[in-house]
Interface confidence: low
């Protein structure tokens, strides 16, 4: 007997062909001999089967001797042997309907697990193979599990169900909820406005939740909450903000924060958390702020940086268009009795300048000592 595989929710067309290329009487029945549909002349008649409102045929094909059974919105329980009776002969077709669903939501937080469950008719023994968007293959039986989802797992998962040498393909769109970057670093001169952006790596039409930015300043003994906010249908509303610093927050996505000015006391690391409605767990993004200050006090020219710098970063002081006077893998450098001119303080990583601050040193006129 012919085997046809179908997908839950889809439409299937079971074929039945007569030798005569004309419209003749036919009936489709299920294995319990309950009539599903047939014809009476040019009219379609339906029997008392549970398929009643979901069963149909193509009248336009009857004249060619084709009498298909179309079943819409397939259910697992539609799996059965269907019999087409035409011209004193019976054609049997075994229909097996499968369903593949994600255990929970198809929107999962980074690091969470994805479980795909196969619904199959009794007596079937299918095998399943799924291919992730990044090309990883997973095989299994009734359930397939993938732990520790990563951002690259977002996209269409293609799963193939194999039964009786026939296959049916499912496509499941999985969205991994995460920020685009796990961590970012902003380099600013003292006094400059600071922009922090937290773009999400996914788009959801109705995004609701709440978030908070905790900040650990390098100079502070403990971290503090700088801002708390709500997200309702992609609109951001600030719940509470510290007075110092007074952060501004954009009203729309991507989440955007503005620090009025960079100051050494603000340099440090922040952790933005976002809790999404109906999701367990939170999204996190780390953000770092490095602040540079160049000062001249009496005969001492100093350049300092605050914040989380890596040990391989180089801090230099140089007179414009000249070689560096001082270069150290430290957070402060200085020059005593600097020459007059435009001095540059540079923070660099493997020759790439990350931050630059200029300071003008004026000539010092020595006044004669009075006799």
């Amino acid at each position: 007997k012919k085997v046809v595989l179908g997908k839950k929710g889809d439409t299937v067309e079971l074929t039945c062909t007569a030798s005569q290329k004309k419209s003749i009487q036919f009936h489709w029945k299920n294995s319990n001999q309950i009539k599903i549909l047939g014809n009476q002349g040019s009219f379609l008649t339906k029997g008392p089967s549970k398929l009643n409102d979901r069963a149909d045929s193509r009248r336009s094909l009857w004249d060619q001797g084709n009498f298909p059974l179309i079943i819409k919105n397939l259910k697992i329980e539609d799996s059965d042997t269907y019999i087409c009776e035409v011209e004193d002969q019976k054609e049997e077709v075994q229909l097996l309907v499968f369903g593949l669903t994600a255990n929970s939501d198809t929107h999962l937080l980074q690091g969470q697990s994805l479980t795909l469950t196969l619904e199959s008719p009794p007596g079937s023994s299918p095998s399943v193979q799924c291919r992730s968007p990044r090309g990883k293959n997973i095989q299994g039986g009734k359930t397939l599990s993938v732990s520790q989802l990563e951002l690259q797992d977002s996209g269409t998962w293609t799963c193939t169900v194999l039964q009786n040498q026939k296959k049916v393909e499912f496509k499941i769109d999985i969205v991994v909820l995460a920020f685009q970057k796990a961590s970012s670093i902003v380099y600013k001169k003292e006094g400059e406005q600071v922009e922090f952006s937290f773009p999400l790596a996914f788009t959801v039409e109705k995004l609701t939740g709440s978030g908070e930015l905790w900040w650990q300043a390098e100079r502070a003994s403990s971290s503090k909450s700088w801002i708390t906010f709500d997200l309702k249908n992609k609109e951001v509303s600030v719940k509470r903000v510290t007075q110092d610093p007074k952060l501004q927050m954009g009203k729309k996505l991507p989440l955007h924060l503005t620090l009025p000015q960079a100051l050494p006391q603000y340099a440090g690391s922040g952790n933005l958390t976002l809790a999404l409605e109906a999701k367990t767990g939170k999204l996190h993004q780390e953000v770092n702020l490095v602040v540079m200050r160049a000062t001249q006090l009496q005969k001492n020219l100093t350049c300092e940086v605050w914040g989380p710098t890596s040990p391989k970063l180089m801090l230099s002081l140089k007179l414009e268009n000249k070689e560096a006077k001082v270069s150290k893998r430290e957070k402060a450098v200085w020059v005593l009795n600097p020459e007059a001119g435009m001095w540059q303080c540079l923070l660099s990583d493997s020759g790439q300048v990350l931050l630059e601050s200029n300071i003008k040193v004026l000539p010092t006129w020595s006044t004669p000592v009075q006799p």
């Epitope: 039409e205 709440s210 509303s237 719940k239």
Partner: antibody
Framework: QVQLVQSGAEVKKPGASVKVSCKAS????????IHWVRQATGQGLEWIGE????????YSNAKFKDRVTITADKSTNTAYMELRSLRSDDTAVYFC???????????WGQGTLVTVSS | DIVLTQSPASLAVSPGQRATITCKAG??????????MNWYQQKPGQPPKLLIY???NLESGIPSRFSGSGSGTDFTLTINPVEENDTATYYC?????????FGPGTKVEIK
């Protein structure tokens, strides 16, 4: 300035369908949701549904779910609301609307009168 | 669904007097300190006009004679003082959750 301009009045027979358009200008069309609201003569306002023009994702009032289709064409900055299987009690003025900076509908189309009569 | 009821159904006020319209929601429309209730004015043959959003915020360009208050389930729109051209129907609307809903309206007439 923000403007929402709707298509003209329609007269339909019961059982027919109607498709009302709403052309937006004066802002980035994909940045804001377009809502549809109707008002029967001398009656109150009733929310039909909404569309996110950027993605085409639409949400509708369960009361209309099987009969309404809300779509948007980004190329022409136009939103559409199609209502099928019209009944005489669908006779109403249909409005499209957009939020301002707050949560209320600050911008409205001029309205389209749909009359369902045999 | 959240059902809104307005009272009174109609109201006649003299110019210079205060008009008060109330709106009661079937459930709270508050979310973390904000009340998702809006008020509109509608004149015959025109679309509604937003007056107040989030219970008490005056929409730009709306005269300060209009004010909104309330939280949870009980909200009030006040017009003080009323002027001749305030003759209209006033609607409350919740934007807390789908389906968004409007109140039945209060018809205000100037004596």
């Amino acid at each position: 300035q923000v403007q929402l301009v709707q298509s003209g009045a329609e007269v339909k027979k019961p059982g027919a369908s109607v498709k009302v358009s709403c052309k937006a200008s004066g802002y980035t069309f994909t940045d804001y949701v377009i809502h549809w609201v109707r008002q029967a003569t001398g009656q109150g306002l009733e929310w039909i549904g909404e569309i996110y023009p950027g993605s085409g994702s639409a949400y509708s009032n369960a009361k209309f779910k099987d009969r309404v289709t809300i779509t948007a064409d980004k190329s022409t900055n136009t939103a559409y609301m199609e209502l099928r299987s019209l009944r005489s009690d669908d006779t109403a003025v249909y409005f499209c609307a957009r939020r301002g900076n707050g949560t209320g509908f600050a911008y409205w189309g001029q309205g389209t009168l749909v009359t369902v009569s045999s | 669904d959240i059902v809104l009821t307005q009272s009174p159904a109609s109201l006649a006020v003299s110019p210079g007097q205060r008009a008060t319209i109330t709106c009661k929601a079937g459930q709270s429309v508050d979310y973390d300190g904000d009340s998702y209730m809006n008020w509109y004015q509608q004149k015959p043959g025109q679309p509604p006009k937003l007056l107040i959003y989030v219970a008490s915020n005056l929409e730009s360009g709306i005269p300060s004679r209009f004010s909104g208050s309330g939280s949870g389930t009980d909200f009030t729109l006040t017009i003080n003082p009323v002027e001749e051209n305030d003759t209209a129907t006033y609607y409350c609307q919740q934007s807390y959750k789908d389906p968004l809903a409007f109140g039945p309206g209060t018809k205000v007439e100037i004596k």
